[in-house]
């Protein structure tokens, strides 16, 4: 098994992740591991020399870069917040602030916007990843209600009056809870004709 630097006639290297083809010398050389950069380029007589990234800089992958990338903070003006700090091996990890979704994506989220409200009777469909897209409002399922205009409110189950020793005064809808009353209270006049004797 050849150790870099080694000759390459077909311009490809055995380990594409950790080696690269250097065209001037027509050889395969080592890439630098994450958290480092090339401080001296390889040649036929010596392999790549790597050095650790300085503070506030990083390289995420095996590379043959002659510089490290500058760490960037999460921009609150763009609706972003930090979830993990920058290290020599990883850029700052950002996400959309609560109540926001990613509106512009270029390899990573660059701009977040406020989530749209879901009207009463609906709730935001749950997504695999929070903040990935705007709300898609879906109707509350049977036996549930939601009575606000909100980006995050969830449909709640209708109250079961009997569980509280009460009786149903008015059935719940998608936008309102069941109305309960004390069984000794008279029915409202508009409902008096519907009582079972």
């Amino acid at each position: 098994q050849a150790v870099p630097p080694y000759a390459s006639e077909n311009q490809t290297c055995r380990d594409q992740e950790k080696e690269y083809y250097e065209p001037q010398h027509r050889i395969c050389c080592s890439r630098c591991p994450p958290g480092t950069y090339v401080s001296a380029k390889c040649s036929r007589i010596r392999d790549t020399v790597c050095a650790t990234c300085a503070e506030n800089s990083y390289n995420e992958h095996w590379n043959y870069l002659t510089i490290c990338q500058l760490c960037r903070p999460c921009d609150p003006v763009m609706g972003l917040e930090e979830i993990a700090p920058c290290t020599s091996k990883r850029k700052t990890q950002c996400r959309c602030q609560p109540g926001m979704f990613c509106a512009a994506w270029a390899l990573e989220c660059t701009h977040c916007e406020l989530l749209s409200d879901c009207p009463p009777g609906t709730e935001a469909e749950l997504k695999d990843e929070v903040g990935k897209g705007n709300n898609h409002c879906v109707p509350c399922k049977a036996g549930h209600f939601q009575n606000t205009s909100s980006p995050s409110a969830r449909c709640q189950p209708h109250t079961r009056c009997e569980n509280q020793g009460l009786v149903e005064a008015a059935p719940g809808t998608a936008q309102s809870d069941t109305t309960c009353k004390n069984p000794l209270e008279p029915l409202p006049p508009e409902m008096s004709g519907t009582m079972l004797m």
């Epitope: 000759a7 006639e9 065209p23 001037q24 010398h25 027509r26 040649s43 036929r44 007589i45």
Partner: antibody, heavy 120, light 107 residues
Framework: EVQLVESGGGLVKPGGSLRLSCAAS????????MYWFRQAPGKGLEWVAT????????YYPDSVKGRFTISRDNAKNSLYLQMSSLRAEDTAVYYC?????????????WGQGTTVTVSS | DIQMTQSPSSLSASVGDRVTITCKAG??????LSWYQQKPWKAPKILIY???RLADGVPSRFSGSGSGTDYTLTISSLQPEDFATYYC?????????FGGGTKLEIK
Amino acid sequence: EVQLVESGGGLVKPGGSLRLSCAASGFTFSDYYMYWFRQAPGKGLEWVATISDGGSYTYYPDSVKGRFTISRDNAKNSLYLQMSSLRAEDTAVYYCAREENGNFYYFDYWGQGTTVTVSS
Amino acid sequence: DIQMTQSPSSLSASVGDRVTITCKAGQDIKSYLSWYQQKPWKAPKILIYYATRLADGVPSRFSGSGSGTDYTLTISSLQPEDFATYYCLQHGESPWTFGGGTKLEIK
């Protein structure tokens, strides 16, 4: 038979430009890295420029970087050296050469050379 | 840049003599050294590559040796056609650099 024939040399004033050519024959030109070397009167040899087989990569020593441009036309089996901002110290015989295609990287064939004189 | 120091710069010898020319590199060049012969108004011609290997068509009286930083070209028995200038070239690391040359003259 492998042949490399340079042309385009001549007398040029300081600051002027010149384009050298090297016509290749007897081998598959597009498979080889090509080079220009030079030799000043009564002096030793000096590397001037390199171009990769497909022409994507070019390399120069600091002495000519930014002033000289190597190029090639594989369809015409031709190598070129565009020289600009010429100086008196660029006066030399210019040779094109082929780099061996294996793993030893020596220069197995050279042209006969073309003379460039930079003088006012 | 890797400095190549070639010696002697000139040498007088007779037909039949054994001649040795040396090249010292500024650092280990791992045998990426070739030797060239040049006659007046002619192009250089490859003699030895990878420090010790004889190029095609080159007479066996020419040989190369050495490793690391020190390399030698030997002509075992000089012939009249061998009077020329000889250059070593390191091509281990760009920029490629030549020795200053050794002019071999008839004594």
